[in-house]
Interface confidence: low
């Protein structure tokens, strides 16, 4: 047993264009209240299906009257937590619906009028006893910020509230096989109360009322020894008389998932992965429309106005699946450059950059060229955490401070002679060649093999390399 607790932080206009109009006015003052509905597992989400884990209604918030002309603010909230007690084990995975209701306080006949302002829904994994989880959900132009947690009620402890704690019988230590109950170190884990009659030697339980058998024993109370010799039938019920253990049907045998759902075994039962348009424990619920809010994690629902037409969920960054129910490992795309460490924070990717790099994806070299002047008209080029200068002709060295001999690299082809010049170098080509670097042979008929010599230049004339 335990309690699911929900703390609403704010309800107001969300980011993005088109701020909603205030739901209250001077003529119609109003106040808010909230309803939460919880369901076990990740499968069923329809607002109409029962809140199998429980539901709760908040107190009414303070009365709010809109100031004329003012934008819709974050609205005043009710005090306190919404608490949903649960009697059995906490399921670990759950679906929630949180509704924001408006109570109009005008002089309506028959008392105040209620109307639903916004509904948000989601599926989450949550261990009991863990810290508050914080969430933001958007419904149209409204944004709801809230935190939630599940906590066990004594004597239950553990992530599912199935382990029990009892005060120590002896001050020094717990009984055989029983651990102290963290964080209540002065208490001891109590043995679970198994099904009545469950063999204390051959049976055990992980949940109250259960009786699971150790290897070699069978029967509802684990009192029947298993004989492996007289088993004839390959599959069927175990025979209590012969003590023959025959494997029972597997949870996925006969595929319990309807409508083309695929079945996978879980430690306790099975799980159906449903095709688009179906949901429920066995994919038995059909006719999902966008009105049912089938897209999770802020997915946008398109189409599906009537039960016969399919809907499509357009998922926000970081989520995928036909209902945006699966988180994408966006770091697997290695978005951080220059050896940056990728962190997927859910709402965003963050790159932790190595020294010398910055930017959202560590794409910028830091300070490579800052304060670095390249002399004599050179330009600074960033790269690899170190700067280098691309020097103007006639200059070289790390900062372009050294005079370079432009002819040192022997740039004139085909025996051309190189002359240093204030604006670069000049090649005097050997007979039969032309071009800035004497790179083009001149055909015997005087035509060049490649671009014609510019007007005023004859083959063999010195050509200045600009």
């Amino acid at each position: 047993a335990g309690v699911f607790e929900l703390q609403i932080h704010s309800f107001g206009p969300g980011p993005g264009p088109g701020a909603p109009r205030s739901p209250c006015s001077a003529r119609l003052p109003c106040r808010l209240f909230f309803r939460v509905c919880l369901k076990p597992g990740l499968s069923e989400e329809a607002a109409e299906s029962p809140c199998a884990l429980g539901a709760a209604l908040s107190a009414r918030g303070p009365v709010y009257t809109e100031q004329p002309g003012a934008p819709a603010p974050d609205l005043p909230l009710p005090d306190g937590l919404l608490q949903v007690p649960f009697r059995d084990a906490w399921p670990g995975t759950f679906s929630f619906i949180i509704e924001t209701w408006r109570e109009e306080l005008g002089d309506q006949i028959g008392g105040p009028a209620w109307s639903l302002l916004a509904r948000v829904a989601g599926r989450r994994r949550l261990a009991a006893g863990g810290p508050w989880a914080r969430d933001i959900q958007r419904a149209g132009a409204w944004e709801l910020r809230f935190s939630y947690r599940a906590r066990c009620e004594p004597p239950a402890v553990g992530t599912a509230c199935t382990r029990l704690c009892r005060p120590r019988s002896a001050p020094s230590r717990c009984g055989p096989g029983l651990r102290p109950c963290a964080p209540l170190e002065d208490e001891c884990e109590a043995p679970l109360v198994c099904r009545a009659g469950c063999s204390p030697e051959h049976g055990f339980c992980e949940q109250p009322g259960e009786c699971r058998c150790l290897e070699g024993w069978t029967g509802p109370l684990c009192t029947v020894p298993v004989s492996t010799s007289s088993c004839l039938s390959p599959r069927g019920p175990s025979s209590a008389t012969t003590g023959c253990l025959v494997p029972g049907p597997g949870p996925c045998d006969g595929n319990p998932c309807a409508n083309g759902g695929s079945c996978s075994e879980t430690p306790r039962s099975f799980e159906c992965t449903c095709p688009r348009g179906f949901y429920g424990l066995r994919c038995e619920v059909s006719g999902v429309t966008c009105a049912d809010g089938p897209c999770f994690n802020g997915g946008l629902c398109v189409g599906g106005a009537d039960p016969d037409s399919a809907y499509i969920c357009h998922c926000p960054p970081g989520f995928q699946g036909s209902n945006c129910e699966k988180r994408v490992d966006r770091c697997s795309l290695q978005p951080c450059r220059n050896g940056g460490l990728c962190l997927d924070l859910g709402h965003a990717l963050r790159c932790r950059c190595r020294a010398g790099f910055a930017g959202p994806r560590c794409e910028h070299d830091l300070d490579d060229c800052a304060g670095r002047a390249c002399a004599n008209g050179g330009t600074c080029v960033e790269g690899g955490g170190a700067h280098r200068c691309s020097c103007a002709l006639g200059f070289g060295g790390r900062d372009c401070r050294e005079r370079a001999d432009p002819c040192a690299a022997r740039p004139c082809a085909h025996g051309g002679r190189c002359y240093a010049h204030f604006s670069g170098l000049v090649c005097a080509c050997a007979p039969g060649y032309m071009g800035a670097r004497c790179e083009f042979p001149v055909h015997p008929d005087g035509a060049s093999a490649l671009p014609a010599a510019p007007p005023g230049l004859r083959p063999g004339d010195p050509q200045r390399y600009l």
Partner: antibody, heavy 122, light 107 residues
Amino acid sequence: QVQLVQSGAEVKKPGASVKVSCKASGYTFTGYSIHWVRQAPGQGLEWMGWINPNSGGTFYAQKFQGRVTMTRDTSISTVYMELSRLRSDDTAVYYCARDGWGDYYYYGLDVWGQGTTVTVSL
Amino acid sequence: DIQMTQSPSSVSASVGDRVTITCRASQDISSWLAWYQQKPGKAPKLLIYTASSLQGGVPSRFSGSGSGTDFTLTISSLQPEDLATYSCQQANVFPYTFGQGTKLEIK
């Protein structure tokens, strides 16, 4: 770089109003909420409220409800905080600060203005 | 409102000392806590967010820990430039609230 620049010091008489501005630069103005925090001489920090610059939505601390108004002008990336019916105990340095909330993570009030001194005296 | 109580209200320590400041919330705030440093005449500066994450550019001698209701800011080896007032702030529930501050003096 990312910064918040506030308007200059103000001297006001009791009962008057003061309007302090906070101009944002170096980041997407509508992407982060702005909070106002004040500090009376020799005292600790006191949270006044916040504004969502995108929608104009606000949330004010109970103590200042009815006296404070937070607005924004997205065209000039500026947030304003107006405090009315000033009293001598409103004498304080008023700071604007950027809220580093992500959807699942809280980065703190990560960028602060330089502060605006408001003195209320006869 | 959630009350944030810091202790001690002032502390005097020598350069190189290890200094610990605690902050207690009146109710569970999970890890939604930040620590700030404020030097005389200056705006506060974010040191730690989400209880234990070090803000970029803050020296690694600062560290934060805790969750729920009890939190700690530790300066592993005090430096002269650490003379300041340190404040905690909760961001779990509106209104955000600050601790009253701890004034750190150098002996």
